[in-house]
């Protein structure tokens, strides 16, 4: 899996989506977890509804919510009033038994408020960013990534 | 594994500038930002700032805007820390961390001492 | 910008005691707070983040308690080389802050 890179301004909300084949994942529940470092254990944040007919309907944890749109195949998780300690790497999973496929790795990147000269540098406009081999970006950052540079090592 | 490691000391004189490198290996280093902490000596530890490895995007601590700069060749996967009109209260160890200083396996340089004096 | 304040400046004991060290913050972090050791020429070392949960590596003598303003590192018996300056740190908010430090001296 390749990281996608996701950065949001503190104090704001930032959404994450997870793109995922509909018909593959049919009938699992997702959930959204935190890396606790490259090789160390993914821990649960928050998941979908326990009924999988109920996964469009949002589930907080804390300032983190999730949300499964299971015929079009995507989940968003919704982090709200981002702050600093939210930066990190994270993953959606797709959930069977007691096991998890990793639909998503994700790079979260907190910037200080724009507005707040005490702490903003230079600040380019945040969004999501993934990165591929071939070097295609989407959405708005200040630069692409050289060919093969994203691609992250394996967590185990 | 992973390893940063940071330039050589330096001697500056008052008003000058200087630019501390820290190369990065052992992971992926747009996977990560790098941080910057200094240390003046027998003091505490004090945040200087933080910089996308993705991007390019910072935060700088107050006190050091328009003086600090943070940036990055991801092409040697290395990040630089600029600081200009060196004062002597600048005399510090300089560190580089990965990620923005509280990853849970937050990685660190091994320093880099600048000294200020004229 | 939140100020965190560690004390006792200067801890003195003898290997085997227990060391209770304090930081509090000026204004609520949550549980969003680390704790560091240095020791002399070294870089600092992470031992606690969240509060109270130990990072890879480090021996279950060391544990975090606390949250809001309040916090504590305690070393249940101090070995030698725990002897060094320890920090804490908060991450809720911007400008990242480290409070002064306490050093922990042999007796």
């Known amino acids: 899996h390749n990281t996608t890179v996701f950065q949001g301004v503190a104090g704001q909300s930032l959404q994450v989506s997870c793109p995922y084949d509909s018909m593959k994942h049919w009938g699992r529940r997702k959930a959204w977890c935190r890396q606790l470092g490259e090789k160390g254990p993914c821990q649960r944040v928050v998941s979908t509804h326990n009924l999988w007919l109920l996964s469009f309907l949002r589930r907080w944890n804390g300032s983190t919510a999730i949300t499964d749109d299971t015929l079009g195949g995507t989940l968003t998780i919704t982090l709200r009033n981002l702050q600093p300690h939210d930066a990190g790497l994270y993953q959606c999973q797709s959930l069977h038994g007691s096991e998890a496929d990793t639909l998503r790795k994700v790079l979260v990147e907190v910037l200080a408020d724009p507005l707040d000269h005490r702490d903003a540098g230079d600040l380019w406009f945040p969004g999501e960013s993934e990165s591929f081999e071939d070097a295609h970006v989407e959405h708005s950052i200040s630069r692409s990534l050289l060919e093969g540079e994203i691609p992250f090592p394996p967590t185990s | 594994q992973v390893q940063l490691v940071q330039s050589g000391a330096e001697v500056k004189k008052p008003g000058a500038s200087v630019k501390v490198s820290c190369k990065a290996s052992g992971y992926t280093f747009t996977s990560y930002g790098i941080s910057w902490v200094r240390q003046a000596p027998g003091q505490g530890l004090e945040w200087m700032g933080w910089i996308s490895a993705y991007n390019g995007n910072t935060n700088y601590a107050q006190k050091l805007q328009g003086r600090v700069t943070m940036t990055t060749d991801t092409s040697t996967s290395t990040a630089y820390m600029e600081l200009r009109s060196l004062r002597s209260d600048d005399t510090a160890v300089y560190y580089c961390?990965?990620?923005?200083?509280?990853?849970?396996?937050?990685?660190w340089g091994q320093g880099t001492l600048v000294t200020v004096s004229s | 910008e939140i100020v965190l304040t560690q004390s006792p400046a200067t801890l003195s004991l003898s290997p085997g005691e227990r060391a209770t060290l304090s930081c509090r913050a000026s204004q609520s972090v949550s549980s969003y707070l680390a704790w560091y050791q240095q020791k002399p020429g070294q870089a600092p070392r992470l031992l606690i983040y969240?509060?109270?949960n130990r990072a890879t590596g480090i021996p279950a003598r060391f544990s975090g308690s606390g949250s809001g303003t309040d916090f504590t590192l305690t070393i249940s018996s101090l070995e030698p080389e725990d002897f060094a300056v320890y920090y804490c740190?908060?991450?809720?908010?911007?400008?990242?802050?480290f409070g002064g430090g306490t050093k922990v001296e042999i007796k």
């Open positions: 740190q908060q991450v809720s908010n911007y400008p990242i802050t």
């Open positions: 969240d509060a109270s």
């Open positions: 961390a990965r990620g923005p200083s509280h990853y849970y396996d937050l990685a």
